[in-house]
């Protein structure tokens, strides 16, 4: 571990003296002196500072721009930033969630492995043998082929990854 520095935790060194840092939610107005304590002021409306600090300006809360498909997930406080998320059907383009894009749909032959959230896109997977998807969808999984046998029917047309099997009546001429 690093050896301890001249000033303690939640202090900073300035002009040969240790001054108290300002607590989260407050900004520095003036450093301490030999005779006075550090002077701090609360951040204003729509501002925040989330650490013990010596910042002279608070940070502005993030703006969730509806024109970019964003909405407020969690309102900011003097100690926390606003958290944005995307409108229904959309997801963030980055971890910082600065803009949104429409959820991707899975093409025919692919099914939804994981439904999209506000922060992650749809994950598609190819339909394996025995399953199909005949629609472009952001919700539909691959469906299993119909089991003709359980309906006392026979396969008339084989299924693919995009189509279901076609069942038909048993050939009655067969012994």
């Amino acid at each position: 571990p690093e050896p301890p520095t001249a000033c303690r935790e939640k202090q900073y060194l300035i002009n040969s003296q240790c001054c108290s840092l300002c607590q989260p939610g407050q900004k520095l107005v003036s450093d301490c002196t030999e005779f006075t304590e550090t002077e701090c002021l609360p951040c204003g409306e729509s501002e925040f500072l989330d650490t013990w600090n010596r910042e002279t300006h608070c940070h502005q809360h993030k703006y969730c721009d509806p024109n970019l498909g964003l909405r407020v997930q969690q309102k900011g406080t003097s100690e926390t930033d606003t958290i944005c998320t995307c409108e229904e059907g959309w997801h963030c383009t980055s971890e910082a969630c600065e803009s949104c894009v429409l959820h991707r749909s899975c093409s025919p032959g692919f099914g939804v492995k994981q439904i999209a959230t506000g922060v992650s896109d749809t994950i598609c997977e190819p339909c394996p043998v025995g399953f199909f998807s005949n629609v472009s969808s952001a919700f539909e999984k691959c469906h299993p082929w119909t089991s003709c046998e359980t309906k006392d029917l026979v396969v008339q047309q084989a299924g693919t990854n995009k189509t279901d099997v076609v069942c038909g009546p048993q050939d009655r001429l067969r012994a």
């Epitope: 050896p3 301890p4 001249a6 303690r8 300035i14 002009n15 040969s16 003296q17 240790c18 002196t33």
Partner: antibody, heavy 116, light 107 residues
Framework: QVQLVQSGAEVKKPGSSVKVSCKAS????????IEWVRQAPGQGLEWMGV????????NYNEKIKDRVTLTADKSTSTAYMELSSLRSEDTAVYYC?????????WGQGTLVTVSS | DIQLTQSPSSLSASVGDRVTITCRAS??????LNWYQQKPGKTIKLLLN???RLHSGVPSRFSGSGSGTDFTFTISSLQPEDIATYYC?????????FGGGTKVEIK
Amino acid sequence: QVQLVQSGAEVKKPGSSVKVSCKASGYAFSDYLIEWVRQAPGQGLEWMGVINPGSGGSNYNEKIKDRVTLTADKSTSTAYMELSSLRSEDTAVYYCARGGGGFTYWGQGTLVTVSS
Amino acid sequence: DIQLTQSPSSLSASVGDRVTITCRASQDISNYLNWYQQKPGKTIKLLLNFASRLHSGVPSRFSGSGSGTDFTFTISSLQPEDIATYYCQQGSTLPWTFGGGTKVEIK
């Protein structure tokens, strides 16, 4: 009144170590940082490091941090500066000073001569 | 490291003259600048801290101004006892650094 009294002059051989003391009086020793500064003959002032006598925590000048150790004894209100692996260019007057908005009070200085 | 450039390096003035020394920092140091006086064979003294605050017991003929990167130290009326070397020092960012010094002499 605030006073910082340093130990006497030293003559040292290259490669050896020196320990300079700085006894403080006239104020609460633990409440102020102690700074160390040196001045080579005919040269300007060079900051060496700072110690918090209350916590024992310190910061050093990167140029000499591997060779300098600052300590403080609260029971005697004395700060110490030890410099090891001495070389001829360490010949200087070594000063301690009290912090608190600049180096507010200075010791009288300790001449350390490094010579073979 | 923050460099402090002090000028002039030496000056000669008459008793009663106004003497001005400048100190320029290589980057913004706000008002964390201190001025010291070093007389031969005497303890170094703090004259001004935070660029312009007179330290206790220092005569009012000494003054300072400036903020950011440019600072000025003034002796309004030079006295014989002011013969000394004067240093600026920044307390903004470690490592603390000093100017090269200005030697003041009497004509």
